[in-house]
C-alpha cells in the first residue's frame, strides 16, 4: 500500500530582469513540485515484472492560485526606476490534467 | 465575466470624508492589482493609486497621499476608496480599474462614481 | 514624474478619413502605453496595449505605433462610432501618468 504521493511548494528566489535592469530585491514564490497520487502496484504490460505507475486520471501537481507584485527595476545610467507587475504562483494543487495544460 | 460595479453617487460637504466601493466578480480578486482614477468634469484622467488585494499593499500618487486611503475586503472581493477633507476639487467621477500586470492594465473598468461637494 | 504630452487635444475629421493623434514621453527610454477610447457617460474602453497590440474586439482599423518616446494612435478609416475622447497612459513609471486626451469629431 502506497501512501499519496506529496504535491509540494518549494520556494524559490530570484530576481526579476528586463534587459540590463534589475529589480531592486529579489521576489519569492512557488515552484510546484511532487507527484499527485495515490499509486497502484500494475502489472508491466511487456515484461512479467510490476511497476509503480498511477492509474485512472492524470493528476499533475501544478499552479492553483497566483498573485501580483509589483517591483521596481532598477537600471544602468541614472535612469527611473521603473515599475512592472509580475505574476507569482502562490499555491498548488494537484488537478486532473486537460489538453489546456502544459504537459512538462 | 469579469465586472467590476461601483457604489452610487455621492453629495457631501466639504470637510466631510466620503468611502466608495468596488466590487469585483468573475474573477479571483486576490490575483490582480485595483486601481482607482480620478476624472475631474471635461478633464483629462489621474491615476491616484493602487492596491494589492492579496497583501494589501498601497502605492499612491504623491498627490494623492494624504487624502485618499485605498483598502479590500478580501472576503467579499469589495475594493474601497475613502477621501477625507474633501474640498471643491475633489468633486469628480472616480473609477475602480483591475490592473492586468504588465500585458492591459485597466482592460476592466467601473462604470464610475460621481462625488459632488457642495455646500 | 513622467509627463504624457498629447495632442491635438481636438480635432475634427470626416467619415472614412485616416486619423493620427500622439503622445510624448517627457521622460524615460521604456515606456509601456496603452491607449484608451472615452465616450461621454462612460468608462474607458481599452484600446490597444504594449504600445501597439490591439485588445480583443478592437476593429482592426486601429493601430498604435511608437518611436522612441512618441507614441501614434491610427484610425485607418473614420467611422462615426468612433466619435469619442482618446487618452494614452504609460505604465512603466510610478505614477501612472495619462496624456490630456484627444477629443475626436466628425465633420
Known amino acids: 500500500d502506497v501512501s499519496e504521493y506529496s504535491c509540494r511548494e518549494l520556494h524559490f528566489t530570484r530576481y526579476v530582469t528586463d534587459g540590463p535592469c534589475r529589480s531592486a530585491k529579489p521576489v519569492t514564490e512557488l515552484v510546484c513540485s511532487g507527484q499527485c497520487g495515490p499509486a497502484r502496484l500494475l502489472p508491466n504490460a511487456i515484461g512479467r515484472g510490476k511497476w509503480w505507475r498511477p492509474s485512472g486520471p492524470d493528476f499533475r501537481c501544478i499552479p492553483d492560485r497566483y498573485r501580483a507584485q509589483r517591483v521596481q527595476l532598477l537600471c544602468p545610467g541614472g535612469e527611473a526606476p521603473r515599475a512592472r507587475k509580475v505574476r507569482l504562483v502562490a499555491s498548488c494543487k494537484c488537478k486532473r490534467l486537460t489538453r489546456f495544460h502544459n504537459q512538462s | 465575466e469579469v465586472q467590476l460595479q461601483q457604489s452610487g453617487p455621492e453629495l457631501v460637504t466639504p470637510g466631510a470624508s466620503v468611502k466608495i466601493s468596488c466590487k469585483a466578480s468573475?474573477?479571483?480578486?486576490?490575483?490582480?492589482?485595483m486601481s482607482w482614477v480620478k476624472q475631474s468634469h471635461g478633464k483629462s484622467l489621474e491615476w491616484i493609486g493602487d492596491i494589492n488585494p492579496y497583501s494589501g499593499e498601497t502605492t499612491y500618487n504623491q498627490k494623492f497621499k494624504g487624502t485618499a486611503t485605498l483598502t479590500v475586503d478580501k472576503s467579499s472581493s469589495i475594493a474601497y476608496m475613502e477621501i477625507r477633507g474633501l474640498t471643491s476639487e475633489d468633486s469628480a467621477v472616480y473609477y475602480c480599474?483591475?490592473?492586468?500586470?504588465?500585458?492591459?492594465?485597466?482592460?476592466?473598468w467601473g462604470q464610475g462614481t460621481l462625488v459632488t461637494v457642495s455646500a | 514624474d513622467v509627463q504624457m504630452i498629447q495632442s491635438p487635444s481636438s480635432l475634427s475629421a470626416s467619415l472614412g478619413d485616416i486619423v493620427t493623434m500622439t503622445c510624448q514621453a517627457s521622460?524615460?527610454?521604456?515606456?509601456?502605453l496603452n491607449w484608451f477610447q472615452q465616450k461621454p457617460g462612460k468608462a474607458p474602453k481599452l484600446l490597444i496595449y504594449g504600445s501597439s497590440n490591439l485588445e480583443d474586439g478592437v476593429p482592426s482599423r486601429f493601430s498604435g505605433s511608437r518611436y522612441g518616446t512618441d507614441f501614434t494612435l491610427t484610425i485607418s478609416s473614420l467611422e462615426d462610432e468612433d466619435l469619442a475622447t482618446y487618452f494614452c497612459l504609460q505604465h512603466s513609471y510610478l505614477p501612472y501618468t495619462f496624456g490630456g486626451g484627444t477629443k475626436l469629431e466628425i465633420k
Open positions: 521622460q524615460g527610454t521604456s515606456i509601456n
Open positions: 480599474a483591475r490592473d492586468d500586470y504588465d500585458a492591459s492594465p485597466f482592460a476592466y
Open positions: 468573475g474573477y479571483t480578486f486576490t490575483d490582480h492589482y
